[in-house]
């Protein structure tokens, strides 16, 4: 019967007793930077080309016995998971292996850098179809390694990496912390985060998604027909590299941004038990388990968005946090979150010719996060309209006044500390839904976009009694672009998007009391693109 991991990544419509994905990734080449491999294993012989690249440190210890099958173990298994005939994800993908890890599984930053440069040069000398680079390794944070990954990604290469097996924040490791890399955590057959001895999968905002990574059957270097189970985020990353190869084989023109958005979109949502993660990491860690799309074609009509969290600002009074979208993505909204509730909101601002989302800490606050909603919106023209604090008691309001521009997100930012303390809630006037409204002491920012066929609507969910969490979701066919709270009273910790749901978090209700101050409204802006839908129908 089908191994659990292959069943897990297969959409229900393809599920059978055997794993038979619609396309095997035959147009894609996957580069594996790992240990040496046993290339004559029946799983991968003829599918994996061993390059002459080798850059590894000496093994530790004078009594180390170099045994070929041990040296090849990790790489052989991963090559099998990616493209193995029997237990592989992308059975049609061809691979090239580079040796950057020694027989003890250790490597160096310099060896990996030279390996990445080798791939870049190979790509220039002999351009092929789409390239996926699998980096099933993790070391301490390295600015230079992250920069090398960024360069390769900007040259059109898809990089997939392991989050790391340290039961820690993936942002502390490289290449996992590189924003351009697709970083993968590991889950088990119960969709729970993988525990490995006293440690386990890494987590946090630098993880893009999770994938099967425990008890994964794959090629064993013990013998040419042997199979073995291995576990870890390397195995999880290999699954995503295989899925990416299949997606790229079906749609070779996909950009890295488009691929990442699709991986997120087609993942299984909210299946991981977040209690395994440290409390402060739960909100930052994506609850996503990778899966193949139900159809390899026809996803083009959807408006894809993802949520990007910034690093924590730190606690100083004027501290800020910045969240950025990828180069090919549009920032459609910006929100902020603080566990203490002490924040001065957020704003969208231009930086290097691109909009970023900046959140501001408040005096006495423990720090803030900026949360960007990053979307794929071809031919978009977006701008931010700002209304300074209003004199009138009705509060500050701003709308999209340019012809053909629609509201995709609202942000508010204020200079005074603890805005909203003992202030009545601001209510949006009836019949004027497409504008941003806030306190009169706040400056309000509206994200206004023009794109062919783009239409958006505002959806609200208000709860009169105090509650720790208020949510509002966009319906089927619509995508959440903006998420904010109305009003910005002091007990609101912030707002953020989780998949297609806008979440507004408040302070513990026991400390709030049940006055009108407890009323919280979550405001979602839901958009869709009729242009993308029509374009997709024409292609079919």
């Amino acid at each position: 019967s089908i191994p659990w991991n292959l069943e897990r990544i297969t959409p229900p419509r393809y599920r059978a007793d055997e794993y038979q994905p619609p396309d095997g990734g035959s147009l894609v080449e996957v580069y594996l930077l790992d240990t040496s491999i046993q290339s004559d294993h029946r799983e991968i012989e003829g599918r994996v080309m061993v390059t002459d690249f080798e850059n590894v440190p000496e093994e530790d210890g004078t009594r180390f016995h170099r045994q070929a099958s041990k040296c090849d173990s990790h790489g052989t298994h991963l090559a099998g998971v990616v493209s193995g005939r029997d237990a592989g994800v992308a059975k049609g993908a061809s691979m090239r292996s580079l040796r950057v890890l020694n027989c003890q599984g250790k490597g160096t930053v310099s060896g990996t850098l030279i390996g990445l440069e080798f791939i870049r040069k190979s790509q220039l000398v002999q351009p092929v179809g789409p390239l996926v680079v699998l980096l099933p390794l993790a070391g301490g944070y390295s600015r230079v390694l992250n920069a090398a990954c960024q360069r390769l990604a900007r040259a059109g290469v898809v990089l997939v990496t392991a989050a790391g097996n340290f039961r820690d924040d993936a942002c502390l490791y490289s290449p996992a912390s590189a924003p351009e890399v697709i970083t993968v955590g590991a889950t088990n057959a119960q969709d729970q985060p993988v525990t490995l001895g006293t440690l386990g999968t890494n987590f946090g905002r630098c993880v893009d998604l999770f994938a099967p990574g425990e008890d994964i059957i794959g090629a064993s270097s013990d013998c040419s027909t042997c199979f073995v189970s291995q576990s870890g985020t390397s195995q999880a990353a290999a699954h995503v590299a295989g899925i990416a190869a299949m997606m790229l084989s079906a749609e070779p023109e996909l950009t890295l941004a488009e691929l990442r958005q699709r991986l997120i979109h087609f993942s299984a949502k909210d299946v991981i038990n977040e209690a395994w993660f440290p409390e402060d990491q739960r909100v930052l860690t994506p609850n996503l388990v990778a899966a193949l799309p139900p159809s390899t074609h026809g996803a083009g009509w959807q408006l894809f968005c993802r949520t990007v969290w910034s690093a924590h600002s730190g606690p100083t009074r004027m501290a800020t946090a910045v969240a950025r979208c990828a180069p090919d993505e549009e920032l459609l909204s910006c929100s902020s979150f603080s566990r203490s509730g002490k924040r001065r909101g957020e704003r969208m601002e231009a930086q290097g010719g691109k909009l970023v989302c900046r959140a501001h800490n408040a005096f006495g606050g423990e720090g803030v996060y900026a949360i960007a909603r990053c979307c794929l919106l071809p031919q978009a023209n977006c701008s931010v309209h700002t209304a300074p604090p209003a004199e009138a008691s009705m509060g500050t309001r701003v709308h999209c006044h340019q012809q053909g521009h629609v509201l995709t997100g609202c942000s508010s930012h204020w200079e005074v500390e603890d805005l909203g303390t003992h202030k009545p809630p601001v209510l949006r006037p009836r019949g004027q839904p497409n504008q941003c409204v806030g306190h009169r002491e706040a400056s309000i920012h509206a994200s206004c976009c023009h794109a062919p066929g783009l239409e958006c609507k505002v959806k609200e969910h208000g709860i009169p009694a105090p509650q720790e969490q208020v949510t509002v979701a966009c319906e089927e066919g619509w995508t959440l672009t903006g998420c904010s709270a109305l009003p910005g009273t002091s007990h609101v910790l912030g707002a953020y998007a989780v998949d297609n749901t806008c979440v507004v978090r408040s302070r513990d209700v026991s400390t709030t009391g049940s006055t009108s101050e407890g009323a919280v409204t979550a405001v979602a802006i839901c958009c869709r693109s009729r242009h993308l839908a029509q374009a997709s129908q024409e292609l079919q």
Partner: antibody
Framework: QVQLVQSGAEVKKPGESLKISCKGS????????ISWVRQMPGKGLEWMGI????????KYSPSFQGQVTISADKSISTAYLQWSSLKASDTAMYYC????????????WGQGTLVTVSS | DIVMTQSPDSLAVSLGERATINCRSS????????????LAWYQQKPGQPPKLLIY???TRESGVPDRFSGSGSGTDFTLTISSLQAEDVAVYYC?????????FGQGTKVEIK
């Protein structure tokens, strides 16, 4: 029900060519390896070679390399064993067997094809 | 190539008695990563294709009577029929499947005494 059905018995003259077949049903033919095994009259089992129908990757026993060709047509779930020039010593029963990958061994066998080569 | 040698070549056992067949491989078929022996036993009755009895040296294939058992590790293996039945008259083959070429033992013929 999972089964392998082989083509019927053949009587040939030395020097003639021959292609025998093995059709899989009741399972995903593409995803399982097919081995061919020879059994000469009154003798034991000899593994000849194997094919993965998904990509037609083959592996031969050194004893049979160059003597026979193994192929497959996944569109009709059929594997083949062929000779370009038969010899009297090729007289034998030939079995195809499905190879289950995790336990790489032969869990399902065809009924066998008897090939007789005689002048 | 891994050479498989079976003993005895033939064996005559009374109904209800124990039959024991040995198989030796020229090199170990036990692998440390999954601690499995890549050895199988097959039964072939006259005019029929072989039938899988045992894999991983000691795991019975589903539907195989429990009077058949396999043991051994590394290079030395045994197939035991605890109480021979009339329908067990056949030739039994061991097979290694750890590396290409896959190889069989020469076979052991089991008859009723």
């Amino acid at each position: 029900q999972v089964q392998l059905v082989q083509s019927g018995a053949e009587v040939k003259k030395p020097g003639e060519s021959l292609k025998i077949s093995c059709k899989g049903s009741g399972y995903s033919f593409t995803n399982y390896w097919i081995s061919w095994v020879r059994q000469m009259p009154g003798k034991g089992l000899e593994w000849m070679g194997i094919i993965y129908p998904g990509d037609s990757y083959t592996k031969y026993s050194p004893s049979f390399q160059g003597q026979v060709t193994i192929s497959a047509d996944k569109s009709i779930s059929t594997a083949y064993l062929q000779w370009s020039s038969l010899k009297a010593s090729d007289t034998a029963m030939y079995y195809c067997a499905r190879d289950y990958w995790y336990k790489p061994l032969f869990d399902i066998w065809g009924q066998g094809t008897l090939v007789t080569v005689s002048s | 190539d891994i050479v498989m040698t079976q003993s005895p070549d033939s064996l005559a056992v009374s109904l209800g008695e124990r039959a024991t067949i040995n198989c030796r491989s020229s090199q170990s078929v036990l692998y440390s990563s999954n601690n499995k022996n890549y050895l199988a036993w097959y039964q072939q009755k006259p005019g029929q294709p072989p039938k899988l009895l045992i894999y991983w040296a000691s795991t019975r294939e589903s539907g195989v009577p429990d009077r058949f058992s396999g043991s051994g590790s590394g290079t030395d293996f045994t197939l035991t029929i605890s109480s021979l039945q009339a329908e067990d008259v056949a030739v039994y083959y061991c097979q290694q499947y750890s590396s290409f070429p896959i190889t069989f033992g020469q076979g052991t013929k089991v008859e009723i005494k």
